[in-house]
């Protein structure tokens, strides 16, 4: 018979032969042969593999570093990685939660809609037309553009969501 060019699900092709993949939680020790099945071994303590695989090494569980404010939310198994979260009152910097911040800042062009609490992080909102923020802040709202008219001045440079308008003197008509 012709050697296979593709294999079924949960199999892999090696040496013109379809071998079974190792199940989640196990790593590959040796490929199958004409006479033997794929040999797999369970991952060790603090290791995991979360897919059907042909990996020869298991992945290390994530370490929730207390020096970064992290703690274990869910302990890893042979099939799943450890899930970290932040100490109470702190917030993850990303979905992967690799470090913690007290709260995040709103970038220039954004203002603070709601200051962080122990439960929720800072909520930012874009500065609408007529308002700006030129700083990164965890408490400052968007500021309204300066009104040149009330100062008897004219707009010399338009404002943006990150910059205030620039006012200047009105052109005096010559006699």
């Amino acid at each position: 018979p012709e050697p296979p060019t593709a294999c079924r699900e949960k199999q892999y092709l090696i040496n013109s032969q379809c071998c079974s993949l190792c199940q989640p939680g196990q790593k590959l020790v040796s490929d199958c042969t004409e006479f033997t099945e794929t040999e797999c071994l369970p991952c060790g303590e603090s290791e995991f593999l979360d897919t059907w695989n042909r990996e020869t090494h298991c992945h290390q569980h994530k370490y929730c570093d207390p020096n970064l404010g992290l703690r274990v939310q869910q302990k890893g198994t042979s099939e799943t990685d450890t899930i970290c979260t932040c100490e109470e009152g702190w917030h993850c910097t990303s979905e992967a939660c690799e470090s913690c911040v007290l709260h995040r800042s709103c970038s220039p062009g954004f203002g603070v809609k709601q200051i962080a609490t122990g439960v929720s992080d800072t909520i930012c909102e874009p500065c609408p037309v007529g308002f700006f923020s030129n700083v990164s802040s965890a408490f400052e709202k968007c500021h309204p553009w300066t009104s040149c008219e009330t100062k008897d001045l004219v707009v010399q440079q338009a404002g943006t969501n990150k910059t205030d308008v620039v006012c200047g003197p009105q052109d005096r008509l010559r006699a």
Epitope: L68, S99, V135, A138, E140
Partner: nanobody, 116 residues
């Protein structure tokens, strides 16, 4: 290495005053937004007060408004919190924090105890 060292805490009677300091080193202090955050025994973190990098804008939690004043002296790389009319509920460890507010910038804090 960024370091924030809080001082000025102590035992004070209700109605008394204290001035906390936060000495900053390892970074250019001027221009950084700074916060005072406190943690009462067995309670969560409470954001007390903040000051903008320029010193022109400030924020106060409702619980301290009219009693506490935040200020900064960029020439001394120091943040201050003047606390007047202290109450028992102000008892906490007070920490200062700098942007980007990472956990590894978090100092030991200074303990304020308000009791008669």
């Amino acid at each position: 290495e960024v370091q924030l060292l809080e001082s000025g805490g102590g035992l004070v009677q209700p109605g008394g005053s204290l001035r906390l300091s936060c000495a900053a080193s390892g970074f250019t202090f001027a221009g950084y937004e700074m916060w005072w955050v406190r943690q009462a025994p067995g309670k969560g973190l409470e954001r007390v007060s903040a000051i903008s990098g320029s010193g022109g804008s400030t924020y106060y939690a409702d619980s301290v408004k009219g009693r506490f004043t935040i200020s900064r002296d960029d020439s001394k790389n120091t943040l201050y919190l003047q606390m007047n009319s202290l109450r028992a509920e102000d008892t906490a460890v007070y920490h200062c924090a700098k942007e980007p507010y990472s956990y590894d910038y978090w100092g030991q804090g200074t303990l304020v105890t308000v009791s008669s």
